[in-house]
Interface confidence: medium
């Protein structure tokens, strides 16, 4: 799986979309998990409704919401009030039995609020980022990870 980068502005909302084949994944619940280290497990953040037919209902866990358009084949995750610690590698997953298929690997980048003059030195940029021109709520820029670009910062 290629990694898609989604960029959001600190303090605002970021929407991540994960398209999938609605026929292939028919009847399956979905989940959003955070990758713990490059080879570590993916820790569940939030999953769609326990009853698959109600997957369109938005479910929240803290500041993260998930909703699934099962007919159109799009899983949408909303990260509200984006913070620097939200930056990192995530996965959209399709659940079947005790297993999970990766629908998309997502790298979330948190950009400094251009209207906030506080020091942005603690904001993490895993690689060369595209400029963020539109700071509208629920808006994001996404791109595929560049070849050779590392989704995790080097560990000392």
């Amino acid at each position: 799986h290629n990694t898609t980068v989604f960029q959001g502005v600190a303090g605002q909302s970021l929407q991540v979309s994960c398209p999938y084949d609605s026929m292939k994944h028919w009847g399956r619940r979905k989940a959003w998990c955070r990758q713990l280290g490059e080879k570590g497990p993916c820790q569940r953040v939030v999953s769609t409704h326990n009853l698959w037919l109600l997957s369109f209902l938005r479910r929240w866990n803290g500041s993260t919401a998930i909703t699934d358009d099962t007919l159109g084949g799009t899983l949408t995750i909303t990260l509200r009030n984006l913070q620097p610690h939200d930056a990192g590698l995530y996965q959209c997953q399709s659940l079947h039995g005790s297993e999970a298929d990766t629908l998309r690997k997502v790298l979330v980048e948190v950009l400094a609020d251009p209207l906030d003059h506080r020091d942005a030195g603690d904001l993490w940029f895993p690689g060369e980022s595209e400029s963020f021109e539109d700071a509208h709520v629920e808006h994001s820029i996404s791109r595929s990870l560049l070849e050779g670009e590392i989704p995790f910062p080097p560990t000392s």
């Epitope: 009847g27 619940r29 037919l53 039995g97």
Partner: antibody
């Protein structure tokens, strides 16, 4: 109507490979999982693996991992099962079977089966 | 892998009488979407298997209403209310909740 037509019987030598085909018609081939199940003489049913023709995604039973390859050709709506390093215990009838979908939810049951292909492994 | 165990392995029934086959799984067959993917197949002599019941209790199209399925979790039952001559063959329970899909050993139904 849905039809799955399999290739004819094969006689193979131990150590060789066999490739069985399954031509599908009457439904959207690309968007339904296709399974392969085998049945040794006088024995029960054994699931080998499956493929989703739309993107080539496959799952195999551990027992056959490394020896079986399931492929699909969307242009001809045909699924293939190739089994290598054949041994006498692989003598069996091999079936392709489509996974049924019903709403709401996936039933994930095999509703249509091919007629079966007898593969005999003998020296 | 999920192990499916059927009982009895063979059954001899007088036409018109009921028959019952039990199937037990080694772990729960409730999927993450809350459906239970337990199915029943019949393989008549010299034929390919055919689907009878899907998702525990749903009769497949064309299957007579004398066939019924029930159960939950790990214990399931197939019942034939009145056995007919055409019902002879081997009955298999199968799960598709978890990959790899697995089948029971089969129950052979004969007519007395």
């Amino acid at each position: 109507q849905v039809q799955l037509v399999q290739s004819g019987a094969e006689v193979k030598k131990p150590g060789s490979s066999v490739k069985v085909s399954c031509k599908a018609s009457g439904y959207a081939f690309s968007s339904s999982w296709m399974n392969w199940v085998r049945q040794a003489p006088g024995q029960g049913l054994e699931w080998m693996g499956r493929i989703y023709p739309g993107d080539g995604d496959t799952n195999y039973a551990q027992k056959f991992q490394g020896r079986v390859t399931i492929t699909a050709d969307e242009s001809t709506s045909t699924a293939y099962m190739e089994l290598s390093s054949l041994r006498s215990e692989d003598t069996a009838v091999y079936y392709c079977a489509r996974l049924l979908r019903n709403q709401p939810g996936e039933s994930y049951a095999m509703d249509y089966w091919g007629q079966g292909t007898l593969v005999t492994v003998s020296s | 892998d999920v192990v499916m165990t059927q009982t009895p392995l063979s059954l001899s029934v007088t036409p018109g009488q009921p028959a019952s086959i039990s199937c037990r799984s080694s772990q729960s067959l409730v999927h993450s979407n809350w459906y239970t993917y337990l199915h029943w197949y019949l393989q008549k002599p010299g034929q390919s298997p055919q689907l009878l019941i899907y998702k525990v209790s749903n009769r497949f199209s064309g299957v007579p209403d004398r066939f019924s399925g029930s159960g939950s979790g790990t214990d399931f039952t197939l019942k034939i209310s009145r056995v007919e001559a055409e019902d002879v063959g081997v009955y298999y329970c199968s799960q598709s909740t978890r990959v790899p899909y697995t089948f029971g050993q089969g129950t052979k139904l004969e007519i007395k």
